[in-house]
């Protein structure tokens, strides 16, 4: 049976086997087409989600679709039901928490009172001044907290206590990519991880350990990527994996936070990378132990210079490494998180591509997660 499962797929009505390589090849090989059902699916960027959270204390902002202007949500008459609606608009199903925070001196958006209309937040028509003088600080999910804070050094062995959101994404029990837990159902990774194998069946996620072989595998229900754009072939290197069963969070299995929409990190901002990838550029093998390293944001202009990536790094990517080189992600780290710590840990990047590993002028290039928040929210909403 194991051999059959490894090399063949069983079609129903009438029952017969087809070679596994015919799964997800774009041809209907089973009479009912089930060989093309459980495949990596693409999902468009979709419409603008009309709510967002700012890095200014996770304050809620609402879009006026008529004018295209954004407004900050006033705390006056804001309720748990409105908080749930806001989070549902972003695709969250968990119970949110919210609190009042004082309107700051740098508040640049108009502040309006919020109401609800057909399960979407709206601005109250006759909105007067914000009497409470407070904004809504909203958290849709408890995230980005670990049991242990890493020390700032070069490269060292990591503990799952520090990075409880890190997962190993495996095909046929072989580690292919890293990934990050975003909520009980969803794992964030890179789209290029699925280039070779587009059938969902054989992909598994392993969570809760820093050692590659030692933890149970979780079944995957769906793998979703963005529609391919030939004008920007290296953009959109992002994928969401929906797990068949929700994760139970613990000290070693927890979600990382998504970045805020306005999370602009300046050059030299310290960041962290983790993974089980190659420790040498051309070989060796995967590391059995999770490794961690501190890096920093590298200016896109520098990264696009003639001796570096020559303009290939787009607005939806970011570079990170250390100026002198030597610390970088490598093959096998793909899909894993590039992380920034403020109050919580945020996944600001996804390990995507680069020329070599650790070269001084060619640092790692990462998918900029904040550029894809809209897509993530639209996927989640479609799957609620």
């Amino acid at each position: 049976k194991v051999i059959l499962d490894k090399y063949y797929f069983l079609c129903g009505q009438p029952l017969h086997f087809i070679p596994r390589k015919q799964l997800c090849d774009g041809e209907l090989d089973c009479p009912l087409g089930e060989d093309e059902e459980h495949c990596v699916k693409s999902f468009p960027e979709g419409p603008a989600v009309a709510v967002r959270l700012s890095k200014d204390r996770s304050t809620l902002q609402v879009l006026d679709s008529a004018t295209g202007n954004w407004f900050s949500a006033c705390f006056d008459n804001f309720t748990e039901a409105l908080a749930e609606t806001a989070c549902r608009q972003m695709g969250y199903s968990s119970k949110p928490t919210f609190r009042a925070v004082e309107i700051g001196p740098d508040q640049d958006l108009d502040v309006v009172e919020i109401t609800e209309n057909s399960q979407e937040l709206r601005m109250r028509n006759s909105s007067g001044p914000c009497l409470s003088g407070s904004l809504v600080s909203l958290h849709c999910l408890a995230c980005g907290k670990s049991l242990k804070t890493p020390r700032v050094v070069g490269v060292e062995e990591a503990s799952v206590d520090s990075w409880p959101w890190q997962v190993s994404i495996q095909y046929d029990k072989q580690h292919v990519c890293g990934g990050s837990i975003l909520d009980p159902h969803w794992v964030l990774t890179a789209a290029h991880c699925f280039r070779k194998h587009t059938d969902v069946f054989n992909w598994k996620v392993r969570a809760g350990s820093d050692k590659l072989g030692s933890f149970p595998s979780l079944a995957v229900a769906k793998i979703i990527i963005i529609e391919f754009n030939p004008m920007y072939p290296k953009d959109n290197d992002i994928a969401l994996m929906k797990l068949q069963f929700p994760l139970t969070f613990s000290g070693t299995v927890r979600p990382i936070c998504l970045p805020f929409f306005d999370e602009e990190l300046t050059p030299a901002t310290p960041l962290w990378i983790i993974g089980w990838g190659f420790t040498k550029q051309n070989g060796g093998k995967m590391s059995d132990i999770l490794l961690q390293a501190s890096v920093q944001v590298i200016d896109s202009t520098r990264c696009n210079a003639d001796d570096a990536y020559q303009g290939e790094v787009t607005e939806k990517m970011m570079c990170a490494g250390i100026p002198e080189g030597g610390v970088d992600t490598c093959q096998g780290d793909s899909g894993g998180p590039l992380m920034y710590q403020s109050d919580q840990w945020h996944v600001v990047g996804i390990v995507s591509w680069g020329y070599g590993c650790g070269g001084p002028s060619t640092p790692g290039v990462y998918t900029k997660v904040s550029a894809y928040l809209n897509w993530i929210y639209n996927v989640w909403k479609a799957e609620l």
Partner: antibody, heavy 116, light 107 residues
Framework: QVQLVQSGAEVKKPGASVKVSCKAS????????MHWVRQAPGQGLEWMGW????????GYAQKFQGRVTMTRDTSTSTVYMELSSLRSEDTAVYYC?????????WGQGTLVTVSS | DIQMTQSPSSLSASVGDRVTITCRAS??????LNWYQQKPGKAPKLLIY???RLQSGVPSRFSGSGSGTDFTLTISSLQPEDFATYYC?????????FGPGTKVDIK
């Protein structure tokens, strides 16, 4: 510096095929998609399709599906565009181009004239 | 496919004039809009990418604005070498499509 050098002008009869070449230099050939765009005399620009020189994968505009084939020779860093079943309305200048944010480079163009 | 329209289709202007060309997409393309300049017998040249970002080496008299469906290319002070045809192009989704062009000639 990046250069895309195309083959010379061609005159073809209706029903025939034409194969235009585009030789790339000054960058890593397999790292960038190549696109083909055409422009009929006095008309606008029309995108035909793309090729990934690394994998050989291609994508064609619906209008040209079944008539266009894009291939590459990595040993010479050359991409080819072949258009078959030519008709008079295929008379145009054909450009190869490396497109994308900030990465815009075009060949000098190849005039293909289809005439009986 | 996303349709792109441009207006005007042609315009006559003098050196030093401020020139504005508009481009409209049949659906929202966010800021995935490029502007090209083409002179007779030459390949197109990229001026502006992502609606408002100036391509390296392009004079600062060229600027772009807009997002969603409506976009504008502005030449603040027309120079003799700017007489050409200008095309907008969306790169939001495949296939990339071009506007029909705006010819700018000497008054």
């Amino acid at each position: 510096q990046v250069q895309l050098v195309q083959s010379g002008a061609e005159v073809k009869k209706p029903g025939a095929s034409v194969k235009v070449s585009c030789k790339a230099s000054g960058y890593s050939f397999t790292s960038h998609y190549m696109h083909w765009v055409r422009q009929a005399p006095g008309q606008g620009l029309e995108w035909m399709g793309w090729m990934n020189p690394n994998s050989g994968n291609t994508g064609y505009a619906q209008k040209f599906q079944g008539r266009v084939t894009m291939t590459r020779d990595t040993s010479t860093s050359t991409v080819y565009m072949e258009l078959s079943s030519l008709r008079s309305e295929d008379t145009a200048v054909y450009y190869c181009a490396r497109l994308g944010q900030q990465l815009d480079y075009w060949g000098q163009g190849t005039l293909v004239t289809v005439s009986s | 496919d996303i349709q792109m329209t441009q207006s005007p289709s042609s315009l006559s202007a003098s050196v030093g004039d401020r020139v504005t060309i508009t481009c409209r997409a049949s659906q929202s393309i966010r800021n995935y809009l490029n502007w090209y300049q083409q002179k007779p017998g030459k390949a197109p040249k990229l001026l502006i990418y992502e609606a408002s970002r100036l391509q390296s080496g392009v004079p600062s008299r060229f600027s772009g604005s807009g997002s969603g469906t409506d976009f504008t290319l502005t030449i603040s002070s027309l120079q003799p070498e700017d007489f050409a045809t200008y095309y907008c192009q969306q790169s939001y989704s495949a296939p990339p499509t071009f506007g029909p062009g705006t010819k700018v000639d000497i008054k």
